[in-house]
Structure formats: structure tokens, C-alpha cells
């Protein structure tokens, strides 16, 4: 099952300033905003073909991923 990349930590850009909890990094304005202001993903209907991405981009935390599978961005912030 394909999954999203681990975080927004950059290959070609520096990691953004970490957001405080309940804030998310908005790539278009390049600063942290309340997560509720961004159209974060909803759970998909049963039987959907792939998992919904987590809610936010968060460079400073990570969780382990299974073999051949990258972890998704974590909830909270970028």
C-alpha cells in the first residue's frame, strides 16, 4: 500500500520552523496557522483504495515505517 512521505523536511529546502501543537505549516504562505484553517483530510469511506494522509506536516517527529513503506506526515504541525 502506497503511503505519503515522512514529513516536510526538505530535500531542496530547509525544514520550516516547527509549529506549536494544534498548528500546521501552510506551504503557500510559509508559516504556521491553526490546523482548523486548513482543509485537513477526512476519513475515507470503507473500501477506499488507499489510506488518507495524516493531518499535518511535522518535520521534527517521526515514527517507524514498515519495510518498503514511508511513514506519513504526522498530525499536529509542520
Amino acid at each position: 500500500m502506497r503511503r505519503g512521505p515522512r514529513s516536510l523536511r526538505g530535500r531542496d529546502a530547509p525544514a520550516p520552523t516547527p509549529c506549536v501543537p494544534a498548528e500546521c505549516f501552510d506551504l503557500l504562505v510559509r508559516h504556521c496557522v491553526a490546523c482548523g484553517l486548513l482543509r485537513t483530510p477526512r476519513p475515507k469511506p470503507a473500501g477506499a483504495s488507499s489510506p488518507a494522509p495524516r493531518t499535518a506536516l511535522q518535520p521534527q517527529e517521526s515514527v517507524g515505517a514498515g519495510a518498503g513503506e514511508a511513514a506519513l506526515p504526522l498530525p499536529g504541525l509542520l
Partner: antibody, heavy 118, light 111 residues
């Protein structure tokens, strides 16, 4: 389920202003980014611009001098105005909204054809 | 603006064929470890439908025969076994920076 529906005149005269509205259900336009895209007949997709959760706007530089995007949060609608239209503005106009954090447009209106002709 | 170039512009294929469409960006669309590359399917008279986001993630309800790969500037959309409902036009699009830009499209026709 988020749904978007475009509405507005299907025929506009040259030099006049094209006005379209996108009505959103299933989500609030005070969250996320709300976009306009157009497609000329038989051609590819062209990005017009957005209005954001805060009401800030971005317009494609190729159209910036003629475009205004606004919103009415009480009706959960956002609108496109394109001034001084010519036949080259004849297109199907779509409203769409991207997901977060990937900014991929996963919700689209069905599109509305606007013809510019006298 | 980031220019997206798709190839081929059209192709003819048969049901069951493996189909590959490529897209090249004029500059990297990677940022913060994400490839901001998306693929859409469009059928005549219909709005585009999101197939793949962030280079390799399936959109909601998209069959697993569709897959995406790539990073940086070079990306691929693959249909592992073409089905009758897959005859359509496919567009790549970058969402790294505005103005968001699209490829010119690849029309997949019946051979």
C-alpha cells in the same frame, strides 16, 4: 462529502465582465483554499487563482490585471470576476479545492462553459 | 512558473495493455521531503478526477492498477492493465508553488 457547484451566465459579450460563483457544501470556505481553473475548448487546464481561508487571494500573473476572486462566507460561496473579456476567454470554468498537506485538488465542481461572443 | 511537459501527447493502446505516461518539470517539485506532483484523469464533458497525489499516493476510490512514481523533475503514471473505462486524457500537475501548472495532457485512445 464536499461538493462544489459553479453558476453564472453562459454567454458574455466581448469587453464585458465574466462573473461566476461557486457554491460549496459539506465544508466551510473559511477553511482551506478555494480555486478557479479554466479549460479552453479542446485544450489543457489553466490555473486562475485562489481565495484562502483568511480571504487572501492569489492570481496567476498571466491574468492578474483582469481577475478578482472574492467570497461571501454567509452563503459559503466564492466568486470569480474576469474583466474585459475576449473570445480567448471562452472556456469551461471550474472551481476546485485542494487537500492538505499535499495541495492536490481532490474536489472539483462539474464546470460551466462560458462563451464570449457578441 | 514551473513548466510541465508530458509525453506522449497521445497514444493508442488495447484493453489489458500496460500504459506509461511521463511528465517532466522545468525545476524540482520536491520540497520538505514531498514530491508535489499530482495526476488527473479527465473524460469528455467531465471535470478532472484526482488519480495520484504526492507522486505516488492513490486518490480516493482510484483502482490499484494506477500507480505513480518519480521525484525531483521526472515522474511517471502507469496503468498496469488498461480497462475500457481508462480511455481518457491524463494530466500531470505540480502543487509545489503557485501558479499551479499542468502538463498539456496525454490522450489515451483505443487501438
Amino acid at each position: 462529502q464536499v461538493q462544489l457547484q459553479e453558476s453564472g451566465p453562459g454567454l458574455v459579450k466581448p469587453s464585458q465582465t465574466l462573473s461566476l460563483t461557486c457554491t460549496v457544501s459539506g465544508d466551510s470556505i473559511t477553511s482551506g483554499y478555494w480555486n478557479w481553473i479554466r479549460q479552453h475548448p479542446g485544450k489543457g487546464l489553466e490555473y486562475i487563482g485562489y481565495i484562502s481561508y483568511s480571504g487572501s487571494t492569489y492570481y496567476n500573473p498571466s491574468l492578474k490585471s483582469r481577475v478578482t476572486i472574492s467570497r461571501d462566507t454567509s452563503k459559503n460561496q466564492f466568486s470569480l470576476k474576469l474583466s474585459s473579456v475576449t473570445a480567448a476567454d471562452t472556456a469551461v470554468y471550474y472551481c476546485a479545492s485542494p487537500n492538505y498537506p499535499f495541495y492536490a485538488m481532490d474536489y472539483w465542481g462539474q464546470g460551466t462553459l462560458v462563451t464570449v461572443s457578441s | 512558473d514551473i513548466v510541465m511537459t508530458q509525453s506522449p501527447s497521445s497514444l493508442s493502446a488495447s484493453v489489458g495493455d500496460r500504459v506509461t505516461i511521463t511528465c517532466r518539470a522545468s525545476e524540482s517539485v520536491d520540497n520538505y521531503g514531498i514530491s508535489f506532483m499530482n495526476w488527473f484523469q479527465q473524460k469528455p464533458g467531465k471535470a478532472p478526477k484526482l488519480l495520484i497525489y504526492a507522486a505516488s499516493n492513490l486518490g480516493s476510490g482510484v483502482p490499484s492498477r494506477f500507480s505513480g512514481s518519480g521525484s525531483g523533475t521526472d515522474f511517471t503514471l502507469t496503468i498496469s492493465s488498461l480497462q475500457p473505462e481508462d480511455f481518457a486524457t491524463y494530466y500531470c500537475q505540480q502543487s509545489k508553488e503557485v501558479p499551479w501548472t499542468f502538463g498539456q495532457g496525454t490522450k489515451v485512445e483505443i487501438k
